[in-house]
């Protein structure tokens, strides 16, 4: 049975040449947290392992940071950065949990963070 | 091009202990997971464990756990996978293999050509 | 730890004719979050290390000829050969690439009838 919620920073927006944290909070389990990869649609960013640590995909290498804690940190912002990233933790026992958030990177200096959701 | 060259064939007897290397080359060694797969004769594919170069931390199946070591040298680009308390069923084809990001995944892309232990009295 | 089950152990298909592989795990592999499956096929030829063939259980390694294709989501999973060439003998294996530690199936021998 999952009973875990994540929490995301839900919708957040940046402005371009910036940096943005991205984070999730798994409540409500007991679960043990065994792994948390960050991930777009279409590719990995980077993986945090309890045994081995923080690995970052080689092609973001350069422009993505650990931390702080089970976040990730996107640095160098461009307009094509706009779009979903996903935070899977894989738990024991429980299994997988996913959260979602939408970044929207701006040309201007307007950049407001969105509400908190949850995902179940 | 990427290769990975491991260390030759060895005979040990049973209880001894093993040290097979993989050298990495044509690519950034801490950038890239290194993984351990055994292979019994005529057997399938079985994960020993992986390092993360980058940070030194390794991660074993719990049946290596205790008897398997992974470690990794920076400076000269090299893995290395030491068993100990070796008994007959260690007698495999021990490859490495490097674990590339393939879109949402981690795969292993680029193998050794394999070390054969071979334990024996 | 998630368990990889292949049908057949072994399969012999005549030159040109179809063969197919089946994959089983004992836990989903399908991220529905991101509707992604963490399933790899690779095909391992005597004396060989194994080689790629397929990754997210349907996309195809760049190189690898199109008589190869993977399917299936979840817990089931199909690698076929449209076409069976000789170069194509070999034993084929399933992998879970969806958590540590990284499973194997035990392998089907492909052969010429």
């Known amino acids: 049975m999952m009973t875990g919620t994540i929490e995301t920073t839900g919708n957040i927006s940046a402005e371009k040449g910036g940096s943005i944290i991205l984070q999730c909070h798994l409540s409500s389990t007991t679960a043990q947290v065994t792994q948390v990869n960050w991930e777009q649609q279409d590719q990995l960013l980077a993986i945090c392992n309890a045994d081995l640590g923080w690995h970052i995909s080689p092609s973001f290498k350069d422009r993505v940071a650990p931390g702080p804690g089970l976040g990730l940190t996107l640095q160098s912002l461009t307009v094509n950065d706009t779009g979903e990233y996903f935070c899977i933790y894989h738990t024991y026992p429980d299994g997988t949990y996913t959260g979602r958030i939408f970044l929207e990177v701006l040309e201007s200096s307007v950049a407001e963070h969105g509400a908190r959701f949850q995902i179940p | 091009q990427v290769q990975l060259q491991q260390s030759g064939a060895e005979v040990k007897k049973p209880g001894a202990s093993v040290k097979v290397s993989c050298k990495a080359s044509?690519?950034?060694?801490?950038?890239?997971?290194i993984e351990w797969v055994k292979q019994a004769p005529g057997q399938g594919l079985e994960w020993i464990g992986v390092?993360?170069?980058?940070?030194?931390?390794?991660k074993y199946n719990e049946k290596f756990k205790g008897r398997a070591t992974i470690t990794a040298d920076k400076s000269t680009s090299t893995a290395y996978m030491e068993l100990s308390s070796l008994r007959s069923e260690d007698t495999a084809v021990y490859f490495c293999?490097?674990?590339?990001?393939?879109?949402?995944?981690?795969?292993?892309?680029?193998w050794g050509q394999g070390t054969t232990v071979t334990v024996s009295s | 730890d998630i368990v990889m089950t292949q049908s057949p152990d072994s399969l012999a298909v005549s030159l040109g004719e179809r063969a197919t592989i089946n994959c089983k795990s004992s836990?989903?592999?399908?991220?529905?979050?991101?509707?992604?499956?963490?399933l790899a096929w690779y095909q391992q030829k005597p004396g060989q290390p194994p080689k790629l063939l397929i990754y997210?259980?349907?996309t195809r390694e760049s190189g690898v000829p199109d008589r190869f294709s993977g399917s299936g989501s979840g817990t089931d999973f199909t690698l076929t050969i449209s076409s069976l060439q000789a170069e194509d003998v070999a034993v084929y294996y399933c992998?879970?690439?969806?958590?540590?530690?990284?499973?194997f199936g035990g392998g089907t021998k492909l052969e010429i009838k």
């Open positions: 293999a490097r674990t590339g990001v393939y879109g949402n995944f981690l795969i292993f892309d680029y």
């Open positions: 044509g690519y950034a060694f801490t950038n890239y997971l």
């Open positions: 390092i993360n170069p980058g940070s030194g931390g390794s």
């Open positions: 836990q989903s592999l399908l991220n529905s979050g991101i509707q992604k499956n963490y």
């Open positions: 997210g259980a349907s």
């Open positions: 992998q879970n690439d969806h958590r540590y530690p990284f499973t």
